[in-house]
């Protein structure tokens, strides 16, 4: 049925963009101009079936399963949800709805190669002599830093920070062999006569 002007405000003269019955040249927000007439856009999650006329409103239909539209639109086809391809190391982080796309992320131990997260690569490990400054996430790689004097890392790891050298002094021992960035100190008894 045709609705009252109060219900369908795009039928106001103002909406048609002109005065004295002239066709509109611009429409309000969430409207579009077609055949010299302002029609309502379809809301997110719906696609356009038919444009409005002088007597009918815009006809919209909800997007199907695995489809979405995330804006007010006049699209005649919904977009397909992104596929998180496990062969590329991807998994679903957030399932798509009729109004949002699926968000993919990487499997544990992997991170995205780009902001769009279209594929994944294995997190890098920090070599001996380096510790993890920042553990990798689904979207960023491991950040490594050299172990400073007083710290060491003797493993290749994507998780381990540099470890402090053992304090021989607290064990009533002395350093028999100096530590390096890759090795801990070796403690031993004090040699009194050197």
């Amino acid at each position: 049925d045709y609705k009252d002007d109060d219900d369908k405000d795009y039928k106001d003269d103002d909406d048609k963009g002109g005065s004295g019955g002239e066709p509109p040249t611009a429409c309000r927000e969430k409207q579009y101009l077609i055949n010299s007439q302002c029609c309502s856009l379809c809301q997110p999650g719906q696609k356009l079936v038919s444009d409005c006329t002088e007597f009918t409103e815009t006809e919209c239909l909800p997007c199907g399963e695995s489809e979405f539209l995330d804006t007010w639109n006049r699209e005649t086809h919904c977009h397909q949800h992104k596929y998180c391809d496990p062969n590329l190391g991807l998994r679903v982080q957030q399932k798509g709805t009729s109004e949002t796309d699926t968000i993919c992320t990487c499997e544990e131990g992997w991170h995205c190669t780009s902001e769009a997260c279209e594929s994944c690569v294995l997190h890098r490990s920090c070599s001996p002599g380096f510790g993890v400054k920042q553990i990798a996430t689904g979207v960023s790689d491991t950040i490594c830093e050299p172990c400073p004097v007083g710290f060491f890392s003797n493993v290749s790891s994507a998780f381990e920070k540099c470890h402090p050298w053992t304090s021989c002094e607290t064990k009533d021992l002395v350093v028999q062999q100096a530590g390096t960035n890759k090795t801990d100190v070796v403690c031993g008894p004090q040699d009194r006569l050197r």
């Epitope: 400054k133 002395v174 350093v175």
Partner: antibody, heavy 122, light 113 residues
Framework: QVQLQQSGAELMKPGASVKIPCKAT????????IEWVKQRPGHGLEWIGE????????NYNEKFKGKATFTADTSSNTAYMQLSSLTSEDSAVYYC???????????????WGQGTLVTVSA | DIVMSQSPSSLAVSVGEKVTMSCKSS????????????LAWYQQKPGQSPKLLIY???TRESGVPDRFTGSGSGTDFTLTISSVKAEDLAVYYC?????????FGGGTKLEIK
């Protein structure tokens, strides 16, 4: 208070060796690294290496391996640096120094000896 | 090896002036594990041994006048003397103790006009 006492000047012939002492007082000698630093005019300061007197453990700058040898005598609280096969490039002031902390946080040198001038000349 | 670069190599100022000198390292001296910068500053007056002024980039050594201030982080560091005195005539060296071998900058010679 902490003091590091070094010997005076040494005049050496090319090819000879010199052993520079650094006597420490005012702290537990065995527990702190002794650092050795070279200073040549126009060359700034160069770290040669370090020795921990309690164990004789050493760290050398690769550049000075084979040139410098560190030892320490805990009975006299004296650290030594021996320089071998002297050339004119070894003419410099050599300082011993001690870090503020014991051994595990990296070394800034809080205490310095007065330096030993080594001159190598035929 | 970590390379330490100081600038300027020399500068001449009048007593009472403010002085800043720069030290740059070829790699970061900031360790995230303790949020400390492994950098020290020394003063060497003519005919004397070097003297420690600053460690951990900004911690003033006991007894050092508060006109000496160290700042900076990562690879860029500055030593500032807020109001130079005649007795500050010296060469100033920075040193990294982040990794072996410990290395020094080439020094900045401060002369008094």
């Amino acid at each position: 208070q902490v003091q590091l006492q070094q010997s005076g000047a040494e005049l050496m012939k090319p090819g000879a060796s010199v052993k520079i002492p650094c006597k420490a007082t005012g702290y537990t000698f065995s527990s702190y690294w002794i650092e050795w630093v070279k200073q040549r005019p126009g060359h700034g300061l160069e770290w040669i290496g370090e020795v921990l007197p309690g164990s004789g453990s050493t760290n050398y700058n690769e550049k000075f391996k084979g040139k410098a040898t560190f030892t320490a005598d805990t009975s006299s609280n004296t650290a030594y640096m021996q320089l071998s096969s002297l050339t004119s490039e070894d003419s410099a002031v050599y300082y011993c120094a001690r870090p503020y902390y014991r051994y595990d946080v990296g070394a800034w040198f809080a205490y310095w000896g007065q330096g030993t001038l080594v001159t190598v000349s035929a | 090896d970590i390379v330490m670069s100081q600038s300027p190599s020399s500068l001449a100022v009048s007593v009472g002036e403010k002085v800043t000198m720069s030290c740059k390292s070829s790699q970061s001296l900031l360790y995230s594990g303790n949020q400390k910068n492994y950098l020290a500053w020394y003063q060497q007056k003519p005919g004397q041994s070097p003297k420690l002024l600053i460690y951990w980039a900004s911690t003033r050594e006991s007894g050092v006048p508060d006109r000496f201030t160290g700042s900076g982080s990562g690879t860029d560091f500055t030593l500032t003397i807020s109001s130079v005195k005649a007795e500050d005539l010296a060469v100033y060296y920075c040193q990294q103790y982040y990794s072996y071998p410990y290395t020094f900058g080439g020094g900045t010679k401060l002369e008094i006009k």
